[in-house]
Interface confidence: low
């Protein structure tokens, strides 16, 4: 009797997933001397162990504990940049501002960035055909649970002033259902975090509106204030100029509003 294979709604595991994770781990530990003690084979074994042979709709944070443990890493708690729906600019920013960190600048985030993975119940196979979609299939899938786990820990580690980059071109600039809105906001520690500063990134060149007055930003301010954390907001009208001024802060054009 041919085995029926579950067809999920989302794309399957990224091609060459094991090789990609291992290669990224090796590269990361070479670039970051403080992580050179990490055994990348053990990291891959722990990653694999989190989802292989498990039903891809029944993954828990516990499944990722061995990987979390191996990925233990110190990041400056006052140099954390969160982002929502604007990953590329956030990463361009930390590539220039080298002392600030997004989750994807940490080992665990770097390993999984832009990848998809899932297994099958009771077999050691990786499913390259399809994986569960968060909305259409189930939320407790390997990818969603991974990002929820690492995002919660990353937010919990933050201190002093935490920055978040938000996409001003979207209808919901702050989205309660995003990872930032559903996980990170609620795991900032009020006894450590003094201020959350939002950077709202404008899309259009002629867009001079004050997007800090947007109803969803006011909603974010309300959530943060109730958690006894101060809130501030800045419009970044010209993201291209913003990045240029981070690279060359002494440029005379960088004294005006960005």
């Amino acid at each position: 009797v041919p085995r029926w294979r579950q067809q999920w709604s989302g794309p399957g595991t990224t091609k060459r997933f094991p090789e990609t994770v291992l290669a990224r781990c090796v590269k990361y530990t070479e670039i970051h001397p403080e992580m050179r003690h990490v055994d990348c084979q053990s990291v891959w074994d722990a990653f694999k162990g989190a989802f292989i042979s498990k039903h891809p709709c029944n993954i828990t944070e516990e499944d990722y504990q061995p990987l979390m443990k191996l990925g233990t890493q110190t990041v400056p708690c006052n140099k954390i940049l969160l982002w929502s729906r604007i990953k590329d600019l956030a990463h361009q920013f930390t590539q220039v501002q080298r002392d600030m960190f997004t989750l994807e600048d940490t080992l665990l985030g770097y390993l999984a960035d832009d990848l998809t993975w899932c297994g099958e119940f009771n077999t050691s196979k990786i499913n390259y055909q399809s994986c569960p979609d968060w909305r259409k299939d189930c939320s407790n899938n390997p990818v969603s649970v991974f990002w929820k786990t690492v995002s919660r820990r990353f937010a919990e580690a933050a201190c002093d002033v935490v920055h978040v980059m938000l996409n001003g071109s979207r209808s919901k600039i702050f989205d309660k259902n995003s990872t930032f809105g559903s996980v990170e906001v609620h795991n900032l520690q009020p006894e450590k975090v003094q201020t959350l500063e939002a950077w709202v990134i404008h899309g259009g060149r002629e867009d001079s509106r004050d997007l800090c007055q947007d109803p969803t930003i006011k909603e974010l301010e309300s959530i943060i204030s109730k958690r006894n954390i101060q809130f501030s907001c800045k419009n970044i009208y010209r993201p291209d100029k913003f990045l240029q001024c981070v690279k060359n802060p002494e440029d005379s054009s960088c004294t005006s509003e960005i």
Partner: antibody, heavy 119, light 107 residues
Framework: QVQLQQSGPELVRPGASVKISCKTS????????MNWVKQRPGQGLEWIGR????????IYNGNFRDKVTLSADKSSNTAYMQLSSLTSVDSAVYFC????????????WGQGTTLTVSS | DIVMTQSHKFLSTSVGDRVSITCKAS??????VAWFQQKPGQSPKLLIY???HRYTGVPDRFTGSGSGTDFTFTIISVQAEDLAVYYC?????????FGGGTKLDFR
Amino acid sequence: QVQLQQSGPELVRPGASVKISCKTSGYAFSGSWMNWVKQRPGQGLEWIGRIYPGDGDIIYNGNFRDKVTLSADKSSNTAYMQLSSLTSVDSAVYFCSRWGTFTPSFDYWGQGTTLTVSS
Amino acid sequence: DIVMTQSHKFLSTSVGDRVSITCKASQDVVTAVAWFQQKPGQSPKLLIYSASHRYTGVPDRFTGSGSGTDFTFTIISVQAEDLAVYYCQQHYTTPTTFGGGTKLDFR
């Protein structure tokens, strides 16, 4: 708010055993290493070992391997350290301290538990 | 095990002075060094991590520097409440080890 609350002072006889607890709140207990540190009166700090509650992994300082047993109860978010075959050199203050995945160093400490071994 | 040596067991100072405490590792620990303050009857308190990063809520008069084997902890302008024992710690390899401590007192 992260808190580590240790059990109270202990006065025990030589040769006996004792179990010290460290009850945590305000963070994901399963996902951070819990460390134990010894401080003898007027002396410095000595790392005993650590436990990862998520999967029960334990790493001991070799100097304490035959003296100490670490454990953790995820249901109550509590870490434990048992010391056995006690002698006067075990008289000290014992601290629990956590280290999270992205947390810098030993950022939160318990208030300490004073152990006195005396006949 | 890596040995962390704090050369001074005691340092005498006065309010307003600049004071530096040194710590030497027996082998390269990159920047995996933290500094703690401990007052009598209290648990240690994290001040500096990763050699030079000030922990949240720590006044900016406390600074740390160094990498490799030589590390320095500095109080730029000593206050009365800074009287305590200061420990360095390396967490580059297991077991993590602490320096013997330097007690800061007033002249």
